[in-house]
Amino acid sequence: CKAMHVAQPAVVLASSRGIASFVCEYASPGKATEVRVTVLRQADSQVTEVCAATYMMGNELTFLDDSICTGTSSGNQVNLTIQGLRAMDTGLYICKVELMYPPPYYLGIGNGTQIYVIDPEPCPDSDF
């Protein structure tokens, strides 16, 4: 398959509610109409799939119902949001883009976005 350049931010800090968003941008060589986006997490040299979606250009990304990811697309950019993150989920999140149709198939893998997640301090008990 032919390599494709994929850009994503180097670092993102998750919100106090455990939500992290970042943009994944790819340099499409042709006029792809069907694109597959996969988010991979790399931690301790282990790579696991976080979520994946295949979408038609101009349409919304559709992740599985139980997915922790949501996203929107605009041109050659995909805006990804990962929810429900905790401190233990801190790691490198890699954006993988595949142009599925029409052929030829193109594959692009970003350098990864380091997402830092800090668990919020528990609220102290208060007496009223």
């Epitope: 042709g30 006029k31 069907e34 599925m100 149709y101 030829p104 198939y105």
Partner: antibody
């Protein structure tokens, strides 16, 4: 190593049917668009039909529309071409190809003759 | 008649440089799709020679090169050798046909 092995070719009478198969190995079959390309004796290459990874998109050359049907089984890594109402002009070597003809099988000969 | 136009024949002497053209339209090459080139030696299946306009698969000598401009593409073979005698085809995706289109092929003769 990528391997594409076509089968199902042979001699058939005009108006008859044949089903070609292509067994694929050495790559992630379910990721790729697949095509059938044919070459009549002494002629050039002609794209016959193609199918997207999910089978959602299928395309056919005008010369075979309504007569040929392409399908795939990703669980079996196999591509198919059902050929009906065969004509003498369908006589050719039929090649199975991956993606935009990146890899080719060795081909299977289809002869339509009475 | 093919959607992509190639000269039916080309020739050259050993060591020479030859160029084969492939002319398309706004629904294929002009639409921004990548052009691919194939070599078919006598009695064998075609083999990918150039993909994505100008990329060589591993094992293809750097004597072969491809380029694309507007609605046309070309294949150049430098330092021509006798084993280069073969049929050469270009191919590209075509929007209006929703499929792959091939050129009519060019028979290269090494004199």
């Amino acid at each position: 190593e990528v391997q594409l092995l076509e089968s199902g070719g042979g001699l058939v009478q005009p108006g008859g049917s044949l089903r070609l198969s292509c067994a694929a190995s050495g790559f992630t079959f379910s990721d790729y668009y697949m095509s059938w390309v044919r070459q009549a004796p002494g002629k050039g290459l002609e794209w016959v039909s193609g199918i997207s990874w999910s089978s959602r998109d299928k395309g056919y050359a005008d010369s075979v529309k309504g007569r040929f049907t392409i399908s795939r089984d990703n669980s079996k890594n196999t591509l198919y071409l059902q050929m009906n109402s065969l004509r003498a002009e369908d006589t050719a070597v039929y090649y199975c190809t991956t993606d935009l003809a990146r890899y080719w099988g060795q081909g299977t000969l289809v002869t339509v003759s009475s | 008649q093919s959607v992509l136009t190639q000269p039916p024949s080309a020739s050259g002497t050993p060591g020479q440089r030859v160029t084969i053209s492939c002319t398309g339209s706004s629904s294929n090459i002009g639409a921004g799709y990548d052009v691919h080139w194939y070599q078919q030696l006598p009695g064998t299946a075609p083999k990918l020679l150039i993909y994505g306009n100008d990329n060589r698969p591993s094992g293809v000598p750097d004597r072969f090169s491809g380029s694309k401009s507007g609605t046309s593409a070309s294949l150049a073979i430098s330092g021509l050798r006798s084993e280069d005698e073969a049929d050469y085809y270009c191919a590209v995706w075509d929007d209006s046909l929703n499929g792959v289109v091939f050129g009519g092929g060019t028979k290269l003769t090494v004199l």
